[in-house]
């Protein structure tokens, strides 16, 4: 006996109760390949999940995470909390970066500020919880009498504020 089920296209299932007739998948179910004997239940995107793509008779729904969360795992199986810049996600929730560390993203861990002195440079702009330090010229370049590619700024008269 030829297996008539192999003729059933995606979006249908082979109904053994009805002489192997190809029946459409019931509402909220799908079959993504032909020859299926059952249709799979559509994924529901609720709670912290939101629908990115609706379920159809031939493909499952696809979920995303609502604002304040980001996807983890295959096909966004999990939603992980976002933190603010200047924080990191710990096992007990979002916590501020410790002094000397920063995070400029909504996810990931706090990283140490760059150590400018390791490159023989000085700190031009101090670091914060949200931003790394900015390294500038080496301290030697800033010392009096050091040669510079740019001419020195003209001296201001006492009592005058900069323009």
């Amino acid at each position: 006996l030829q297996d008539l089920c192999s003729n059933c296209p995606a979006g249908t299932f082979c109904d053994n109760n009805r002489s192997q007739i190809c029946s459409p998948c019931p509402p909220n179910s799908f079959s993504s390949a032909g020859g299926q004997r059952t249709c799979d239940i559509c994924r529901q995107c609720k709670g912290v999940f939101k629908t990115r793509k609706e379920c159809s008779s031939t493909s499952n729904a696809e979920c995303d995470c609502i604002s304040g969360y980001h996807c983890l795992g295959a096909e966004c199986s999990m939603c992980e909390q976002d933190c603010k810049q200047g924080q990191e996600l710990t096992k007990k929730g979002c916590k501020d970066c410790c002094f000397g560390t920063f995070n400029d993203q909504k996810r990931g861990i706090c990283r140490p500020w760059t150590n400018c002195s390791l490159d023989g440079k000085s700190v031009l702009v101090n670091g914060t919880k949200e931003r790394d330090v900015v390294c500038g010229p080496s301290p030697a370049d800033l010392s009096p009498g050091a040669s510079s590619a740019t001419p020195p700024a003209p001296a201001r008269e006492p009592g005058h504020s900069p323009q």
Partner: nanobody, 124 residues
Framework: EVQLLESGGGLVQPGGSLRLSCTAS????????MSWVRQAPEKGLEWVSS????????FYADSVKGRFTISRDNSKNTLYLQMNRLTAEDTAVYYC?????????????????WGQGTTVTVSS
């Protein structure tokens, strides 16, 4: 390939118990701390418990302390979570997770591999 496979989930009545298992493969199990993390139907991920590579150090979220016990059998490459006095608030998908190093604590969130999850439903 690193794989984590959870089992033991199911439907249980309030006040009941369940024991989850997680079988690991593809890495030297005893070299890494392991965690259980859960996601309730309407919520984001919530860390539940962690255990060091040797099993000598364990940590728990306040919400499960005194009710849940994490353990491991390194000879069987298996992680366990014994859950007692279950309540409706424990209803979630429970994920087994590998941490990035041998040691662990109740602060640093250092997970690099996740299992597929097993569903625990607490209902009368």
């Amino acid at each position: 390939e690193v794989q984590l496979l959870e089992s033991g989930g199911g439907l249980v009545q309030p006040g009941g118990s369940l024991r989850l298992s997680c079988t690991a493969s593809g890495f030297t199990f005893s070299n890494y701390a392991m965690s259980w993390v859960r996601q309730a139907p309407e919520k984001g991920l919530e860390w539940v418990s962690s255990i060091s590579g040797s099993g000598g150090s364990t940590f728990y979220a306040d919400s499960v302390k005194g009710r849940f016990t994490i353990s491991r059998d390194n000879s069987k490459n298996t992680l366990y979570l014994q859950m007692n006095r279950l309540t409706a608030e424990d209803t979630a998908v429970y994920y087994c997770a590998k941490e990035g190093s041998n040691g662990t604590d109740d602060y640093h969130y250092d997970i690099d591999v996740w299992g597929q999850g097993t569903t625990v439903t607490v209902s009368s």
